[in-house]
Each structure stands twice: as structure tokens, then as C-alpha cells.
């Protein structure tokens, strides 16, 4: 079940000073997710800039329907996708030496979900089946978070699927499911 991007409101989150975030990995092939980009600003070096607005990640608002098997929410729900430039990265020469490219260095930062909210959603089912409910876990806010290798990727495990996590009525699932189950958990999910 694809995202229905009716909205694309971006809110910038400013992390604590002294943190040096890096851009989040791109969410795979989601053409409907109009990410807010860097706004055409020139690249900066993390230890050279004094502008804290450079260290921001954005909360993009997206609207989608919650599905659970054959059932679908009567109304779409709106939630956040954490995206955007979490902060500048060092500008390093690439391996070939032609031009320059972005490569993270120093502390590892990600624009990730900060808080979640659970929402009970009414689902309508086809063929005369009684309406159902599902509890859905939705991203409520984002933040730039410094990750260490000791996080063992747990912070990122659901990065990209959390946003796609659905459903109270089916309440959120603690863990992301496989792609197929994810349909049921996007359709079903959590």
C-alpha cells in the first residue's frame, strides 16, 4: 500500500549544538515521498560553520490509508517521515580524485524518529464484514541523533519502515515485519 502524499509540510528540527549530523540514507525508491532537500544551500564543513540551522532534519507530513488485510481505514492518517539534511558532512575527495563528494566523518548522526504516538483507527472491510480497529504506531517527531557503533544499528533498524508502520486497530507492532507481512502491516503492521 503506497504512501498517499497529500501533504509535504516540512519542519526543521535543530539538534543540540556541538553535534555533527550526517545525512540520512535515502529511503529506497519512494517516489511519492517528496523529501525536502538542502534548499540549494552551498555545502559546509561541520567544524567551520557557525550556523546551527545547518544541523537540521525535517519532519515531512504524509498522509496514507491504514490497511489490515482486506480492510482499510475510512479516513487517511497523517504522520511524519524524518528526512532532510541532518547536518553537514566533511567534503572529501573521492577515490578517483576528480571532483568532490560527500562522505560522513566524525560522529555518526541520523535524522530519526524521536517520539511515537499510537492511534486507534477504524477500518472498513469489504463484503459485509464487521468494521475492525487497529492501533497504529505513528511517528510524532524527529530528531538528529548521534549514533555510536554500540547502537548496533538498532536505531536504524526500523528507519524507513517506521514511517510506513501502521496501525492501531491493529496497534503498532513492536518489530517491523518482512516485506510481505509489511503489506499486511502497513496493512497490518508493526
Amino acid at each position: 500500500q503506497g504512501w498517499q502524499a497529500f501533504k509535504n509540510d516540512a519542519t526543521e528540527i535543530i539538534p543540540e549544538l556541538g553535534e555533527y549530523p550526517e545525512p540520512p540514507p535515502e529511503l529506497e525508491n519512494n517516489k511519492t515521498m517528496n523529501r525536502a532537500e538542502n534548499g540549494g544551500r552551498p555545502p559546509h564543513h561541520p567544524f567551520e560553520t557557525k550556523d546551527v540551522s545547518e544541523y537540521s532534519c525535517r519532519e515531512l507530513h504524509f498522509t496514507r490509508y491504514v490497511t489490515d488485510g482486506p480492510c482499510r481505514s475510512a479516513k487517511p492518517v497523517t504522520e511524519l517521515v524524518c528526512s532532510g539534511q541532518c547536518g553537514p558532512a566533511r567534503l572529501l575527495p573521492n577515490a578517483i580524485g576528480r571532483g568532490k563528494w560527500w562522505r560522513p566523518s566524525g560522529p555518526d548522526f541520523r535524522c530519526i524518529p524521536d517520539r511515537y504516538r499510537a492511534q486507534r483507527v477504524q477500518l472498513l472491510c469489504p463484503g459485509g464484514e464487521a468494521p475492525r480497529a487497529r492501533k497504529v504506531r505513528l511517528v510524532a517527531s524527529c530528531k538528529c541523533k548521534r549514533l555510536t557503533r554500540f547502537h548496533n544499528q538498532s536505531e536504524l533498524k526500523d528507519f524507513g519502515t517506521e514511517a510506513a508502520r501502521p496501525q492501531k486497530g491493529r496497534k503498532p507492532r513492536p518489530r517491523a515485519r518482512s516485506a510481505k507481512a509489511n503489506q499486511a502491516e502497513l496493512e497490518n503492521a508493526y
Partner: antibody, heavy 119, light 107 residues
């Protein structure tokens, strides 16, 4: 890691009450519906009821209505099921389970608590 | 209440066999059926939900089908670890109800 850890085995006399606990970790119980299911020795599974920890809303199987009370303590992420006026045929393993759906299947289960009712 | 009648109650099979278990609902439950596997002394494990959707990590040899009142769980090629008891459950409406179980034993 998502876990449901239940309290230990109990032996009760007929007419007594038992309260079984189920402590959740790795997730927020308010985001799910907590169910209780029992299984008598050598028998099948029997649904008792469910509670929404977020608001205390409860649905019981009518056959247990009046004898069972389900509660949750969200501060400790623990669900409780109390069964009163115990009879010998209440001897069973009691499981807690949860899911986000209402009604639901059960994605995760506790390890079970054996309640033996014997005089 | 919706009754779920499972058959057979037990069956004997060999490793590599194709095994089919059926579940019949007393009224239309659409596709709101789940299947579980349970081994002695253990809690049930979810295999299938929405009649045919495999739960995460469940081997592809397990498949479910059906809608309305008739449902089937199929194990395409029985493995040693599949000897267990299997239950169907309807979640179309409360109270939730389970089938009586099918015990799959080694022939």
C-alpha cells in the same frame, strides 16, 4: 527484544482466586491489545478476553463474565488476569498474548502459567 | 459464537509428505483466520494470518488458503521440526474461537 514474561505456577483450592501477571518488555503495552488464552491439559486453546491498556476497555468471553477481571499497570508494562471461584476444570496453562488488531490474531505469546486447582 | 471445526484431529505422516489440515467455520468469517503451531510445553506460534499471509520467518512450505467458511493449512514437504499440533483461529468477531487442533505425528 520483545518479550512477555508471566508469573510462576500456582496451586489453588476450589473456590479460591488466582491472579496471573504478564510483564511486557521491548514495546509499549498501550500500543496493543492484551489477550488471555488458556489451555487445559491435553486440550485445545480457549480465549478468555482482551483488554486495551490505553483506556481499560475490556471484552470477555461470556462464559467467563463475572469470574474474570483483567487489568493493566502501564507504569510497569504489566497485564493481570484474575480468575475467581476456581473449579477443578479451571486447571490449565494461562497465556497472555498481544496484537494491534481488534479483533486479532496473536503475534506474540507469554511462556504460560500453569494454574492447578485441586482440593 | 462462531465454531471452528478442524479436521482431522490427528494424522500420521512421514518426512517429505504433503500434509493438509482443514478448518470449517460455522458462519462466514471472510478471511479472518489465523493458524498456529504448538509443540509440547510451549506457547503457540503464529504461522499464518488473513488466511494466507505467512508470518515473518515462517518457512515457505507452510501455506494457507480459503475464505468464507472453509480454510486449509498445507505443509508442502513435512520436515522433522513440523511434528506438532496445529490450530486455526477466527478473528472475524468476538468471542475469538479456535479449532480443536490437529496433531501431526510421525508415521
Amino acid at each position: 527484544e520483545v518479550q512477555l514474561v508471566q508469573s510462576g505456577a500456582e496451586v489453588k483450592k476450589p473456590g479460591a482466586s488466582v491472579k496471573v501477571s504478564c510483564k511486557a518488555s521491548g514495546f509499549n503495552i498501550k500500543d496493543y491489545y492484551m489477550h488471555w488464552v488458556r489451555q487445559a491439559p491435553g486440550q485445545g486453546l480457549e480465549w478468555i478476553g482482551r483488554i486495551d491498556p490505553e483506556n481499560g476497555d475490556i471484552i470477555y468471553d461470556p462464559k467467563f463474565q463475572g469470574r474474570v477481571t483483567m487489568t493493566t499497570d502501564t507504569s510497569t508494562s504489566t497485564a493481570y488476569m484474575e480468575l475467581r471461584s476456581l473449579r477443578s476444570d479451571d486447571t490449565a496453562v494461562y497465556y497472555c498474548a498481544y496484537d494491534a488488531g481488534d479483533p486479532a490474531w496473536f503475534t506474540y505469546w507469554g511462556q504460560g502459567t500453569l494454574v492447578t486447582v485441586s482440593s | 459464537d462462531i465454531q471452528m471445526t478442524q479436521s482431522p484431529s490427528s494424522l500420521s505422516a512421514s518426512v517429505g509428505d504433503r500434509v493438509t489440515i482443514t478448518c470449517k467455520a460455522s458462519q462466514d468469517v471472510f478471511t479472518a483466520v489465523a493458524w498456529y503451531q504448538q509443540k509440547p510445553g510451549k506457547a503457540p506460534k503464529l504461522l499464518i494470518y488473513w488466511a494466507s499471509t505467512r508470518h515473518t520467518g515462517v518457512p515457505s512450505r507452510f501455506s494457507g488458503s480459503g475464505s468464507g467458511t472453509d480454510f486449509t493449512l498445507t505443509i508442502s514437504s513435512l520436515q522433522p521440526e513440523d511434528f506438532a499440533t496445529y490450530y486455526c483461529q477466527q478473528y472475524s468477531s468476538y468471542p475469538l474461537t479456535f479449532g480443536g487442533g490437529t496433531k501431526v505425528e510421525i508415521k
